[in-house]
């Protein structure tokens, strides 16, 4: 009679984490008498997965009824597969012996690989804001995937980026892997509404990649441009001076008016105008009582934006160009009178 063969038809199988794996095994003969055992690995360190005769294997069920006298199918199903279950599984026939069964024949083995989805990519930007023309780094991380092969791409507003470096860890074997990528992005003044996207593609995602995003509004600082202008005379002794603060981001801004270098008023930007590109404009104005000045006045609009060093713009107000009030005995009012509401807004 032909000697018993142990047939494992599948050289390899791939199963998604959480699913069940079916490991097929048939024998070609009922002789010799003895049990079948399933092992992961080979040699003295192999791990017993299922023993037909004894033991408790809660995740393992047999595909066919092993109690039937003529059964030759010893396939098993392992439930709730995790990446830690990866390995080579062997179906081994033992021959009845005393006191122990003797290993008789082994199948060729079935390699089980486990597919695990990557976690949603998390994109993080620099800790501090940066200004246009500067290069900033963004990182993208995703974890827990298997197998190791994975593709990561970076985009800015739909345009693919090329300046990035990606590592998949660990370099050696692991039940699951992580990816870490750093991309360099050059900021422009128009980037307040821009997004940086990290896209991860993996065999487990069936062509539907995962994306992580970061808004450049959290990274960029667009410094304001200042313009101080003198408006036409409102009343005979009053001049309206405005400070236009344009194209800044974020909103946090404090403005100080100085008269010949002396602080006269400080105000915080409140009602702002938003531009199409996401930046803001703001305007503050002053009514200057010219009659209170004997000499020309240097007015300075000083702006502190988002905690950065102040920038300023000055305007020289020519007093001589305006007639002085004659014969007034009343003490002059304050040199600077602001319009109501205080500071105004535009």
């Amino acid at each position: 009679e032909e000697e018993l063969q142990v047939i494992q038809p599948d050289k390899s199988i791939s199963v998604a984490a959480g699913e069940s794996a079916t490991l097929h095994c048939t024998v070609t003969s009922l002789i010799p008498v003895g049990p079948i055992q399933w092992f992961r690995g080979a040699g003295p360190g192999r791990e017993l997965i299922y023993n037909q005769k004894e033991g408790h294997f809660p995740r393992v069920t047999t595909v066919s009824d092993l109690t039937k006298r003529n059964n030759m199918d010893f396939s098993i199903r392992i439930s709730n597969i995790t990446p830690a279950d990866a390995g080579t599984y062997y179906c081994v026939k033992f021959r009845k012996g005393s006191p122990d069964h003797v290993e008789f024949k082994s199948g060729a083995g079935t390699e089980l690989s486990v597919r695990a989805k990557p976690s949603a990519p998390v994109v993080s930007g620099p800790a501090a804001r940066a200004t246009p023309q500067h290069t900033v780094s963004f990182t993208c991380e995703s974890h827990g995937f298997s197998p190791r092969d994975i593709t990561l791409k970076w985009f800015k507003n739909g345009n693919e980026l090329s300046d990035f470096q990606t590592n998949v860890d660990p370099a050696g074997d692991s039940v699951s892997y992580s990816i870490h990528s750093t991309a360099k992005v050059v900021l422009t003044r128009e980037d307040v509404h821009s997004q940086v996207i990290c896209e991860v593609a993996h065999v487990t995602l069936q062509g539907d990649p995962l994306r992580g995003t970061a808004n450049l509004s959290e990274t960029i600082r667009v410094p304001p441009t200042l313009e101080v202008t003198q408006q036409p005379v409102r009343a005979e002794n009053q001049v309206n001076v405005t400070c236009q603060v344009r194209k800044f981001y974020p909103q946090r801004l404090q403005l100080t008016w100085l008269e010949n270098g002396n602080v006269s008023r400080t105000e915080t930007a409140s009602t702002l105008t938003e531009n199409k590109d996401g930046t803001y404009n703001w305007m503050s104005w002053l009514l200057v009582n010219v009659s209170a000045h004997r000499d020309d006045v240097k007015l300075t609009c000083q702006v502190e934006h988002d905690g950065q060093p102040a920038v300023s713009k000055s305007h020289d107000l020519k007093v001589s160009a305006h007639p002085k009030e004659q014969g007034s005995n009343t003490a002059p009012g304050p040199a600077l009178a602001s319009a109501a509401p205080l500071g105004g807004s535009g």
């Epitope: 080979a42 003295p44 360190g45 192999r46 024949k105």
Partner: antibody, heavy 122, light 112 residues
Framework: QVQLQESGPGLVRPSETLSLTCTVS????????WSWIRQPPGKGLEWMGF???????FYNPSLKSRVTISLDMSMNQFSLKMTSVTAADTAVYYC????????????????WGQGTTVTVSS | DIVMTQSPLSLPVTPGEPASISCKSS???????????LDWYLQRPGQSPQLLIY???NRASGVPDRFSGSGSGTDFTLKISRVEAEDVGVYYC?????????FGGGTKVEIK
């Protein structure tokens, strides 16, 4: 092709612990046993122990109380620690790969590192 | 532990001539699956050992066919059909039936 590289200090003081690492490159740790074998100067080979890909260890009883072999699959490395060393532990230490097949068992130590000399001296 | 005994201790050889090394084990290395758990290794001067023969008679990859292994149970032989200069070194047998794996004391092959 698979290569093994031992690393660790060349000199260890008596009564201290010897620590060696073997880095596996060009192949996987899975499905193999990973051995440490030593050779005292001018003498023969002594098997110290091995570890399987699942972390199961087997040691030479003559050294068992002093030897620990561990595996870091993520780094493709395995390590040897031997405590309370004496001058008798001076040797060339080799790391090696042992093949294994179901139905056969151990099937030859087919890849060896180049060996690292460890001297135990004060 | 299984004790492995090699002979001779030293073997002077002439290039082109055959050579033979004996290895005996203190217990049978023949398992019920019909395999003999005996390997042969060559350690060339200043080098690491290399696998020549595994499971008693199987030549390892890249090993010249002038090397052959034979024997069963407790008595094993490594034969070199025609010795070449590169064959000098120490030859070791090793049993892989059970742990601890044990080596023979070695046979030093040198050119006459």
């Amino acid at each position: 092709q698979v290569q093994l590289q031992e690393s660790g200090p060349g000199l260890v003081r008596p009564s201290e612990t010897l620590s060696l690492t073997c880095t596996v490159s060009g192949g996987s740790i899975r499905n193999y046993y990973w051995s440490w074998i030593r050779q005292p100067p001018g003498k023969g080979l002594e098997w110290m122990g091995f570890i399987y890909d699942n972390g199961r260890t087997f040691y030479n009883p003559s050294l068992k109380s002093r030897v620990t072999i561990s595996l870091d699959m993520s780094m493709n490395q395995f390590s040897l620690k031997m405590t309370s060393v004496t001058a008798a532990d001076t040797a060339v230490y080799y790391c090696a790969r042992v093949r294994a097949y179901s139905g056969i068992g151990l099937d030859g130590t087919d890849v060896w590192g180049q060996g690292t000399t460890v001297t135990v001296s004060s | 532990d299984i004790v492995m005994t090699q002979s001779p201790l030293s073997l002077p050889v002439t290039p082109g001539e055959p050579a033979s090394i004996s290895c005996k084990s203190s217990q049978s290395l023949l398992y019920s699956n019909a395999y003999n758990y005996l390997d042969w290794y060559l350690q060339r001067p200043g080098q690491s050992p290399q696998l020549l023969i595994y499971l008693g008679s199987n030549r390892a990859s890249g090993v010249p066919d002038r090397f052959s292994g034979s024997g069963s149970g407790t008595d094993f032989t490594l034969k070199i059909s025609r010795v070449e200069a590169e064959d000098v070194g120490v030859y070791y047998c090793m049993q892989a039936l059970q742990t601890p794996l044990t080596f023979g004391g070695g046979t030093k092959v040198e050119i006459k």
